[in-house]
């Protein structure tokens, strides 16, 4: 299926991205609470099934998309269910600051997709 | 108040382009994309694709692959699509929207602007 | 592309009779799905987005839910001002895409 034209956003942007609305922040979303993902099973997509449900939060929204593109690039993305541990709620900020540790282990280890 | 703004109507000849512009206002112009939606005739919703203002970043719909053109003006806080090579079936209302409350969940749009393609 | 599967096309029922529309997706897209009413001339509005959550002013007999694939949108009571064609939005995947509509009139 078609992917949407656009240049995917690269990691470096993506980690760029979360330490930009990390840094110096306590909390995140009003301290809103998502699901504890696996970034394991597809980071991405898993990231972005616990983040899309967070709405009213205009920090995160570019995050988000960033996200969404870089899950849409993915063979049949759409069709991946991430581990998610519907007994464990996180706030987003940790969701977040968990991302962003992962991502930059694949990053340093260049493993980019 | 939320407020987008769109240009007049445009009548053009095949093989043309037009560009349509989204002047918006009540809020911080570089917080939200603008997104751009046409809808032809009688026809449904299809998306075109957003612009970042904020970055300048980018998503195409495929549809419309190298024919649109995604601009923003930080300084007049108007957004700007482009879409040339225009054939009948780019007669629409082409209409400009941002999302606030949910990422990419267009909420404020603006009143529509037809282009009508003829010789 | 994520295709979206709006059913039926057309409807027409009486004033305060329950309208529904159902929406499915060719994919799962979990909650990431909206609702819009558009009337002639006029753009679209939001009523519902992410599944179930009511847009600011959208009165209490307009509701959404499902999961997944499958989707729902519910009028409890029809009112002569709802007379429109509503649209749903998948907005999980880009590209973005919408449903091809529901015309809903009234008897």
């Known amino acids: 299926s078609p992917s949407p034209v656009t240049p995917s956003p690269t990691l470096k942007e993506l980690i760029e991205e979360l330490v930009n609305i990390t840094q110096n922040q306590a909390s995140l979303c009003n301290g809103s609470m998502v699901w504890s993902v696996n970034l394991t099973a597809g980071m991405y997509c898993a990231a972005l099934e616990s983040l899309i449900n967070v709405s009213d939060c205009s920090a995160i929204q570019r995050t988000q998309r960033m996200l969404k593109a870089l899950c849409s690039q993915k063979p049949a993305a759409g069709q991946i269910s991430s581990e998610r541990s519907r007994d464990t709620k996180i706030e987003v900020i940790q969701l977040v600051k968990n991302l962003l540790t992962y991502v930059r282990g694949v990053y340093r280890h260049g493993n980019f997709r | 108040e939320v407020q987008l703004v769109q240009s007049g109507a445009e009548v053009v000849k095949p093989g043309a382009s037009v560009k349509v512009s989204c002047k918006t206002s009540?809020?911080?112009?570089?917080?939200?994309?603008i997104y751009w939606v046409r809808q032809a005739p009688g026809a449904g919703l299809e998306w075109i694709g957003y612009?970042?203002?904020?970055?300048?970043?980018?998503t195409y719909n495929q549809n419309f692959k190298d024919r649109v053109t995604l601009t923003a003006d930080k300084s007049t806080s108007t957004a700007y699509m482009e879409l040339s090579s225009l054939r009948a079936g780019d007669i629409a209302v082409y209409y400009c929207a941002t999302a606030v409350v949910a990422t990419d969940v267009m909420e404020n749009w603006g009143q529509g602007t037809l282009v009508t393609v003829s010789s | 592309e994520i295709v979206m599967t709006q059913s039926p096309a057309s409807l027409s029922l009486s004033q305060e009779e329950r309208v529904t529309i159902t929406c499915r997706a060719s994919q799962n897209v979990r909650n990431a799905l909206a609702w819009y009413q558009q009337k002639p001339g006029q753009a679209p509005k939001l009523l519902i987005y992410?599944?179930?959550n009511r847009y600011t002013g959208v009165p209490s007999r307009f509701s959404g839910s499902g999961s997944g694939t499958d989707f729902t949108f519910t009028i409890s009571s029809l009112e002569p001002e709802d007379v429109a064609v509503y649209y749903c939005?998948?907005?999980?995947?880009?590209?973005?895409?919408f449903g091809a509509g529901t015309k809903v009139e009234l008897k």
């Open positions: 992410l599944t179930s």
């Open positions: 009540g809020y911080s112009f570089t917080d939200y994309p």
């Open positions: 612009i970042d203002p904020y970055n300048g970043g980018t």
């Open positions: 939005l998948q907005h999980w995947n880009y590209p973005l895409t």
